[in-house]
Each structure stands twice: as C-alpha cells, then as structure tokens.
Interface confidence: low
Amino acid sequence: VDSGNDVTDIADDGCPKPPEIAHGYVEHSVRYQCKNYYKLRTEGDGVYTLNDKKQWINKAVGDKLPECEADDGCPKPPEIAHGYVEHSVRYQCKNYYKLRTEGDGVYTLNNEKQWINKAVGDKLPECEAVCGKPKNPANPVQRILGGHLDAKGSFPWQAKMVSHHNLTTGATLINEQWLLTTAKNLFLNHSENATAKDIAPTLTLYVGKKQLVEIEKVVLHPNYSQVDIGLIKLKQKVSVNERVMPICLPSKDYAEVGRVGYVSGWGRNANFKFTDHLKYVMLPVADQDQCIRHYEGSTVPEKKTPKSPVGVQPILNEHTFCAGMSKYQEDTCYGDAGSAFAVHDLEEDTWYATGILSFDKSCAVAEYGVYVKVTSIQDWVQKTIAEN
C-alpha cells in the first residue's frame, strides 16, 4: 500500500524515535518472530536492516523473507532414491470419543497446501462421544430396593434430578448434551398447565454421581399423557469420561420376554429412604399380558378395572413394556423413574437403553415396573435433538 510517505518515516506504531548520539546514526532494524506453536524457517537470524535503497535486508539471506512453520517437534523424514515424501496426518480422538467421518481420518497435503481426504475432500472429521461402553461394566454374577451398590461406576449414563421440592428422580444421558426422563418427573410439584419454560429453571441435575450441570430447556413428548417421556437439553456439552458417558439408543427392540436388563437408580431403598449411593438391580422383561392383567384386571378393554396393588395406575399401552421383580424381591421404587432399563448386547459389547422407567411405585409390593419403549420414541428423540 502506498501511504504517500517516505519509507524512512516509520509508521506511528507507538514506538518512540530513539535519541540521536554525537557522531553516530540510528539504523532501523526489525526482528521477525513467530506466534505460539510456529517456528522461524530461515538461513539467517531473522533480523532485517533498512538499506539505503529502502529495502529490508538480512546479512545472510538478503531480501529473502523468513517463513513461520508449524513447530510440532516432528523431524523431517529422510529422503529415498527415486522417491519422495508425501505429507499425511491421521486424526484420532481422545479417550471416550470416537471419529465420525465417512473417510478414514487420513489427510494428505495437496499441491495447493490443503489437507485432503480421498473420500471426503477437505471436510474434517468430528470426535463424538462413545456410548454404552462403561469402563467397569456391571457384573452379572453379583446379585432399588435391596439391589447392589454401584461402587465401580458401571452406569455412567445415570443422572440424578432433584425437583424444587427436593424430590429425587432419575434421568438418562443419551448424548453429550441431552437426557431422557419421564414427563411425570418433569411435572413433579408443578400444576398440569405448567409449561416446559416454567419447569426447566426449577430442576437441578447431576451427572457422574455428583457433578452439577445446568439445564437449558426441557421438551415434553407431544403425547406425554400416554408416552411418559421428556427430553432435557443441557446448557453445555458434558465432558465424557469414565464417570460420565451416554448410553446408546437401540436400533432393534431388546424388550423380549425373559431378557434381563439392569436398572440403576437414586430412588428409595428398603428403608424407604432416598439412597445416598447409586444402586442397581437386574430385572427380567415380563409378559405384557400378565402385566396388564396384574394392573388392569384384563387385556380386554371393556373388562379393564383399576387393580394396582399400590393404588396408582401405570400407563400401559403399545409404547410400554413391563419388567418383573427379581427372585430376591429386589425392585425399583419411588425416585427411580427416568432411569434406563439397560441391556448389554454381548455380541457388540455395548449397552443400550431399551426402556425408561415410568412407573416406579412397585417397590416390591406390585410385581412389575413399567417402562416406556425407547424404540417407540426414537424418531421423536432424533427429530427433537436435530431441531434444537
């Protein structure tokens, strides 16, 4: 840019003119330096002096300017006869994250100095949270009433939600920023005409056992009176680690009769007190007709009559399944709702959220807990997350 000024009138960059000395003169010189993580590439020393032709000259390299190159501490590979070195990098993800890309994560430097992948061009991969791979999975040999202490952190997707009246319930982490819970949990101590906007600020949510996370919004299922489900969006993504990890959403329905799932929870224990420690229980999926008869007397709509042994009727429909008490009289209880019925797919070595506990009033009195089928709500979950 031609400033219209003589070059020797150095730009006013806030640098005071040095004082003159007798029988001497001031020589203008500059030193080139590089930003963090870059280093100077030059055969000179980076110091350039203004000559009488108003050119910046370095003693060793003349008017050839230095360059800043990435200082990654990576030595230059040796050259080979009749060959050349091709620069390539492989993207990898930190622990508990995996690469999401249609390519292989390897990028090569092209002639235009762009990093290019054969399959996806210059589109970079992303690191997404691993789901359903706890570092210390629950041991099926051990035997949330009764139940076992989750001493090893086997249920890193389990969150604890506390209402503004200090009632504890469950929620289930399904990705870095979203959790599933029940609509009933969200409405605890709220009137039926409360809105999602009213509800969000009244909830406190903990992940990783005791780490508080802030809620941005809640989204209720459009048919929440029949499908007892809501989603919670966090203000920030959580860092996934061995204590905090989402559970995977299933691509198939694991809720077949007899299949055993694990349900963890912060709900009431055998003394009917809220537990200070996360507990878990192993429960089998029950026959749906038996469950309906247990709670409603009949599977025939016109013959149904409220029969719940605990005085509260669960929602039972095509979006739900039941799980029975264990043979040890272990069961879910108040405060466990919102927790996942987690099934371990042994072939994939992955844990899937097959259901979300909706009816947690069984407490070893009624025979069945009732769960919302995750396969029934999966389209809505994915659509909601995409839109928000």
Epitope: Q211, L212, S239, R243
Partner: antibody
Framework: EVHLLESGGGLVQPGGSLRLSCQAS????????MSWVRRAPGKGLEWISS????????YTADSVKGRFTISRDNSKNTLYLQMNSLRAEDTAAYYC??????????????WGQGTTVTVSS | DIQMTQSPSTLSASVGDRVTITCRAS??????LAWYQQKPGKAPKLLIY???SLESEVPSRFSGSGSGTEFTLTISSLQPDDFATYYC??????????FGQGTNLEIK
C-alpha cells in the same frame, strides 16, 4: 485470548461496603459459571461465591453468607461481588475465576490478576 | 462441610528432585479434585483437574493421582520455575469448594 480483569478494590472502614467488578473477554461469558476466590495475607485460598450461567444457580460460602452477594450482567460480560458489613478479616486479594470446561461447577482454569481489599479503621 | 488436609505444609527440595504432595479429603469426593500453583503476587494457575487430568500447556512433569479421599501431586523432576505454593481443591458441587491449606515448595 481469554482474559479477566478485576476492579473496585481499595481501603474501606469496618462495616463499610465495596462492589468488585470482573470484566471478562475472549470467551462466551453467558455460557460459563463464574466464581470469586480470595487470599488473605499469610493465609491460603478461600472460595467465596459462585454463580452459574443460568443465575438460578448461586452458591456462597458460610463465612460471607448474608454479607456478600454475587451477580452478573451477561450483556456487559461482567461479574460482580457486592460486599457489605465488611470486617478486618475480609482483607485479602480477591480473584474472579472462570470454570475450566463445560460443567457448570468445575475447576477454574482462568483467573484474573486480583484486586486488593483492605478493611481497616 | 468437607475438609481438605494437605501435607507437608512446607517442602524443601532441589532442582531435579522428584517431589510428592498429598491431599486428604474428610469424605469421598470421587475424582473431583484440582491442583493449583500460586506464586507471590500472582493469580493461581490450574495444573490438574479430575484428580489426574493435566491441564493444557502444563508441563508433563506434573501428574496427579488418587480418588475418593486420598490424592497426590507429583513433580517428576523439579525445575527452577516450580518453586511456589501448591493447593488442592475439592470442587464437587455437593459441598462448598474446599481448598487445602497449601504446601510451600522452597529451594533447599
């Protein structure tokens, strides 16, 4: 560059009030929980108060509860600490701090240089 | 409230030494522990979070370990820049944030 700059410290008499400010820059202020921490002469670090990105979440140490109030103005990227009924034992360097990562309550990775409060008659 | 007890209060060591500072919590805090370094007249600097995770740009000679109630900070080979005061901090949200009383690491 992430930067926090405290101001508002000074000399105040016992029973007096001061309001500290912390100007934040270089990050999304309204998505981060913020805290005040102090260090009294010859003593260790002491947590004072924290406020979430969502201001429903406020926590204050028992030693200052009822006297100190934390607040924030997200439109001005500024954190405040209103200090009333000051005592000699409140004399300290006061730091504001930003949480490290995405958790609302986390270790603090960015600190201001501090502002000094002296309570003396 | 939770109490954090750091030891020793003062530690004399030489450049190149391996030093260990310990921190004990009065109740389990899982992995929610941080270590900070503070030099006179300066703000504290985060070294370790989640008990053992190294904060970015902190030299790898610093390491942390432990969970529950017992934690340690280790400096594998002391450098002149490492002489400072070190604090542990519990930041589990169920308690007030509690600091240890500090360990002054000085030149022998």
């Amino acid at each position: 560059e992430v930067h926090l700059l405290e101001s508002g410290g000074g000399l105040v008499q016992p029973g007096g009030s001061l309001r500290l400010s912390c100007q934040a820059s270089g990050f999304t202020f309204n998505s981060n929980a913020m805290s005040w921490v102090r260090r009294a002469p010859g003593k260790g670090l002491e947590w004072i108060s924290s406020i979430g990105a969502n201001t429903n979440y406020i926590y204050t140490a028992d030693s200052v509860k009822g006297r100190f109030t934390i607040s924030r103005d997200n439109s001005k990227n500024t954190l405040y600490l209103q200090m009333n009924s000051l005592r000699a034992e409140d004399t300290a360097a006061y730091y504001c701090a930003k949480n490290r990562d995405r958790y609302s309550y986390d270790a603090w990775s960015v600190w201001g240089q501090g502002t000094t409060v002296t309570v003396s008659s | 409230d939770i109490q954090m007890t750091q030891s020793p209060s003062t530690l004399s060591a030489s450049v190149g030494d391996r030093v260990t500072i310990t921190c004990r919590a009065s109740q389990s805090i899982d992995i929610w522990l941080a270590w900070y370094q503070q030099k006179p007249g300066k703000a504290p600097k985060l070294l370790i979070y989640e008990a053992s995770s190294l904060e970015s740009e902190v030299p790898s000679r610093f390491s942390g370990s432990g969970s529950g109630t017992e934690f340690t900070l280790t400096i594998s080979s002391l450098q002149p820049d490492d002489f400072a005061t070190y604090y542990c901090q519990a930041y589990n949200s169920n308690y007030p944030y509690a600091f240890g009383q500090g360990t002054n690491l000085e030149i022998k």
